[in-house]
Interface confidence: medium
């Protein structure tokens, strides 16, 4: 583990798994509210690579509800509203940290977990594989 | 807090702030690898709304370095490579959980924090405001 002189005022951990198991304050501080109160947008409808949002729920996880983007089309929407299949709608994926109850159903013991979510879609030029 | 009957075998928390302060195993489990290997992509270059990645650093946070997407253009890139200013490149934002040391410099006590990051960009039809 890390050899750090313990500051007075630091919580002490007697857990044999320290420093893998630590105390975490779940009174989640949100750094965004003051700077960006209006986060939700209608980009999912206005994008040339529009997407639908699907609800993924798991009561053993925090956050328990995660919304996943699914691109509506394989291609991208043109100005006339038709789909251009020479372009591709692709999901922009991102890993997020979540907390999973471990052991299951225990209210105050968690494991950090990384999960991959699709946040939205973007329109890209396809990669063309030329056959010799 | 969550009203869950305590299982035998669950760690006990004597913390007066329970369940705000919990034990978290930091041995991060990755749900992606087996089912969905990382597909970190070159979409940032191939998108009609391409973006650059900018470094944001904070040593008291995990992860300490976060690379944020910044759209390259106000408009969107057309097939001929020119920018179409009748369309808009906009950032897709997502909240992620990060860990912050609290009290500062304490090695085994953390607070979860939500921050808003720009993950990538998408091309949208602009909202036109007609002046009477």
């Amino acid at each position: 583990g890390i050899a750090i002189p313990r500051n007075s005022g630091c919580p002490n951990s007697e857990d044999k798994n320290f420093p893998r198991t630590v105390m975490v304050n779940l009174n989640i501080h949100n750094r965004n509210t003051s700077t960006n109160p209006k986060r939700s947008s209608d980009y999912y409808n206005r994008s040339t690579s529009p997407w639908n949002l699907h609800r993924n729920e798991d009561p053993e996880r925090y956050p328990s509800v995660i919304w996943e983007a699914k691109c509506r089309h394989l291609g991208c929407v043109k100005a006339d509203g038709n789909v251009d299949y020479h372009m591709n709608s692709v999901p922009i994926q991102q890993e997020i940290l979540v907390l999973r109850r471990e052991p299951r159903h225990c209210p105050n013991s968690f494991r950090l977990e990384k999960i991959l979510v699709s946040v939205g879609c973007t329109c890209v030029t396809p990669i063309v594989h030329h056959v010799a | 807090g969550i009203a869950i009957p305590r299982n035998s075998g669950c760690p006990n928390s004597e913390d007066k702030n329970f369940p705000r302060t919990v034990m978290v195993n930091l041995n991060i489990h990755n749900r992606n690898t087996s089912t969905n290997p990382k597909r970190s992509s070159d979409y940032y270059n191939r998108s009609t709304s391409p973006w650059n990645l900018h470094r944001n650093e904070d040593p008291e946070r995990y992860p300490s370095v976060i690379w944020e997407a910044k759209c390259r253009h106000l408009g969107c890139v057309k097939a001929d490579g020119n920018v179409d200013y009748h369309m808009n490149s906009v950032p897709i934002q997502q909240e992620i959980l990060v860990l912050r040391r609290e009290p500062r410099h304490c090695p085994n006590s953390f607070r979860l924090e939500k921050i808003l990051v720009s993950v990538g960009c998408t091309c949208v039809t602009p909202i036109v405001h007609h002046v009477a």
Epitope: G1 | W67, I96
Partner: antibody
Framework: EVQLVQSGAEVKKPGESLKISCKAS????????TSWVRQAPGQGLEWMGG????????DYAQKFQGRVTITADESTTTAYMELSGLTSDDTAVYYC???????????????????WGQGTTVTVSS | EIVLTQSPDFQSVTPKEKVTITCRAS??????LHWYQQKPDQSPKLLIK???HSISGVPSRFSGSGSGTDFTLTINGLEAEDAGTYYC?????????FGPGTKVDIK
Amino acid sequence: EVQLVQSGAEVKKPGESLKISCKASGGSFSGYGTSWVRQAPGQGLEWMGGITHFFGAVDYAQKFQGRVTITADESTTTAYMELSGLTSDDTAVYYCARDPNEFWNGYYATHDFDYWGQGTTVTVSS
Amino acid sequence: EIVLTQSPDFQSVTPKEKVTITCRASQNIGAELHWYQQKPDQSPKLLIKYASHSISGVPSRFSGSGSGTDFTLTINGLEAEDAGTYYCHQTDRLPYSFGPGTKVDIK
């Protein structure tokens, strides 16, 4: 400018232990990790293990499990690698490297070794 | 464990020539592949991260491409100072591994 300065060359006998230090300066220490990589004479690079300073979480390559211990001291911004039960096969240059632990292009804790120490030459001989 | 293979093992090149080094992973590693240059008696130096991202301070003649299992490092217009050994490095799964290296010599 980030700099990693390692302790000096060592000559050891088989069965002895080795402890190398890696002092970091010029950047945040707690926000990063330190990995250890070795290179036997005329050979390629071999990852031994690494530590995430923020948590003190350590990962070791299976090959070195039980023989290697990686620690760090935030107060002196120094990482350490201890290797026990030395044999002549452990004769190598040992490098420490900074592991940024970044959130990159949508992924947590991605790793590339962006700064390296100058290397510590270790000779194990009876 | 992910095994990286590099080709060629050795390349002797004339200055201003284009050099291509390939790295193949035994499993899909996405874009978690980095390239390092090591000159004799020096520490490795990061050239390219995440398959294709350039590093500030590294000359623009160095570029990388690929994803999944096949990756390429390209030196467009080799210079005398580019002599050394080039390693690919995967950080997708533990244990992290390096390729065996490609030695580039100047003719």
